[in-house]
Interface confidence: medium
């Protein structure tokens, strides 16, 4: 399955929207910085696109979940958030279309399940952090910057796999 060109463009738009969503400077939130332990190795050890697609799907689904909560709606600009949802939704559709075409429909390798679990745990850490920080503006800014970084890393892996085909 070959993801459409628009998927690549959608990834860049998602990053642009995340950048536009910034409300305060990260420099004013230095005391709130946190290492969420993004499982980068889980994106680096998937050698076939068939293995990366479910992991990338999980990543985008979790971002969608994170930013579609009531607390998130209160934190961000509604227009930007709507555009953000649209881009994420389109990317989920692209990835799901690949799964339907037969990529990853065979029995899921344990390694892939472990990778999906690692992504879920990463987002659990982010959610817990937000709760502990009482969804403060600085906490959301730290999370926004973190999602930009991790999303960029994960989509870059996906692009590199495509370029090797």
């Amino acid at each position: 399955c070959d993801l459409p060109q628009t998927h690549s463009l959608g990834s860049r738009r998602t990053l642009m929207l995340l950048a536009q969503m910034r409300r305060i400077s990260l420099f004013s939130c230095l005391k709130d910085r946190h290492d969420f332990g993004f499982p980068q190795e889980e994106f680096g050890n998937q050698f076939q696109k068939a293995e990366t697609i479910p992991v990338l799907h999980e990543m985008i689904q979790q971002i969608f979940n994170l930013f579609s909560t009531k607390d998130s709606s209160a934190a961000w600009d509604e227009t930007l958030l709507d555009k953000f949802y649209t881009e994420l939704y389109q990317q989920l559709n692209d990835l799901e279309a690949c799964v339907i075409q037969g990529v990853g429909v065979t029995e899921t390798p344990l390694m892939k399940e472990d990778s999906i679990l690692a992504v879920r745990k990463y987002f659990q850490r982010i959610t817990l952090y937000l709760k502990e920080k009482k969804y403060s503006p600085c906490a959301w800014e730290v999370v926004r910057a973190e999602i930009m970084r991790s999303f960029s890393l994960s989509t870059n892996l996906q692009e590199s796999l495509r370029s090797k085909e």
Epitope: R12, R13, M16, E159, S160, S163
Partner: antibody
Framework: QVQLVQSGAEVKKPGASVKVSCKAS????????MHWVRQAPGQGLEWMGE????????IYAQKFQGRVTMTRDTSTSTVYMELSSLRSEDTAVYYC????????????WGQGTLVTVSS | EIVLTQSPATLSLSPGERATLSCSAG???????LYWYQQKPGQAPRLLIY???NLASGIPARFSGSGSGTDFTLTISSLEPEDFAVYYC?????????FGQGTKLEIK
């Protein structure tokens, strides 16, 4: 500061190929897609395609598919655009332009390379 | 392919006057991905406006952009001698990315 320096002017015969280079400096080369845009004499701008220098992934405009090849050399922070089966209507100034997000999109351009196709 | 049509093709005005340049898209363009560039003879294009209405770095406040959907406008409130050039609208809302054919702003 960000700089994109392109190779010099070329004169080619119809049917030949041309390879234009664009050397980037002043930023992390692998962090931004690089685009190629051309402009025929007295005409408007035309997007040809783009390359991700991080891993070489390319996306070409349908019009140039099969005739254009974009490559990169990360060791020298240089991208290349090769156009084959040249015809007279390919006579143009070819620009490289750096992609980015928001205000960074096409904020930096090479100086342009004139390619003349003539028999 | 989204076709961008600019009007007028040529605009003749005097310094100090107000310039209004139009860009009409063949199909809807997300305003976040509509940009304007200025080009002078022998030079590469220069970014003026990004995301329909945002001024690029170093661009004077006399330049402004507006619009949505299929109709976009670049306005120069009071023309300076250095503003006479060709102006292009550009979209990266969908592939292939396209430019308008340009509007030449000339001194009357």
């Amino acid at each position: 500061q960000v700089q994109l320096v392109q190779s010099g002017a070329e004169v080619k015969k119809p049917g030949a190929s041309v390879k234009v280079s664009c050397k980037a400096s002043g930023y992390t080369f692998t962090n931004y897609w690089m685009h190629w845009v051309r402009q025929a004499p007295g005409q408007g701008l035309e997007w040809m395609g783009e390359i991700n220098p991080s891993h070489g992934r390319t996306i070409y405009a349908q019009k140039f598919q099969g005739r254009v090849t974009m490559t990169r050399d990360t060791s020298t922070s240089t991208v290349y655009m090769e156009l084959s089966s040249l015809r007279s209507e390919d006579t143009a100034v070819y620009y490289c332009a750096r992609g980015g997000l928001g205000p960074a999109w096409f904020a930096y351009w090479g100086q342009g390379t004139l390619v003349t196709v003539s028999s | 392919e989204i076709v961008l049509t600019q009007s007028p093709a040529t605009l003749s005005l005097s310094p100090g006057e107000r310039a209004t340049l139009s860009c009409s898209a063949g199909s809807s363009v997300d305003s976040s991905y509509l940009y304007w560039y200025q080009q002078k003879p022998g030079q590469a294009p220069r970014l003026l406006i990004y995301s329909t209405s945002n001024l690029a770095s170093g661009i004077p406040a006399r330049f402004s952009g507006s619009g949505s959907g299929t109709d976009f406008t670049l306005t120069i409130s009071s023309l300076e001698p250095e503003d006479f050039a060709v102006y292009y609208c550009h979209q990266w809302s969908s592939y292939p990315f396209t430019f308008g054919q340009g509007t030449k702003l000339e001194i009357k």
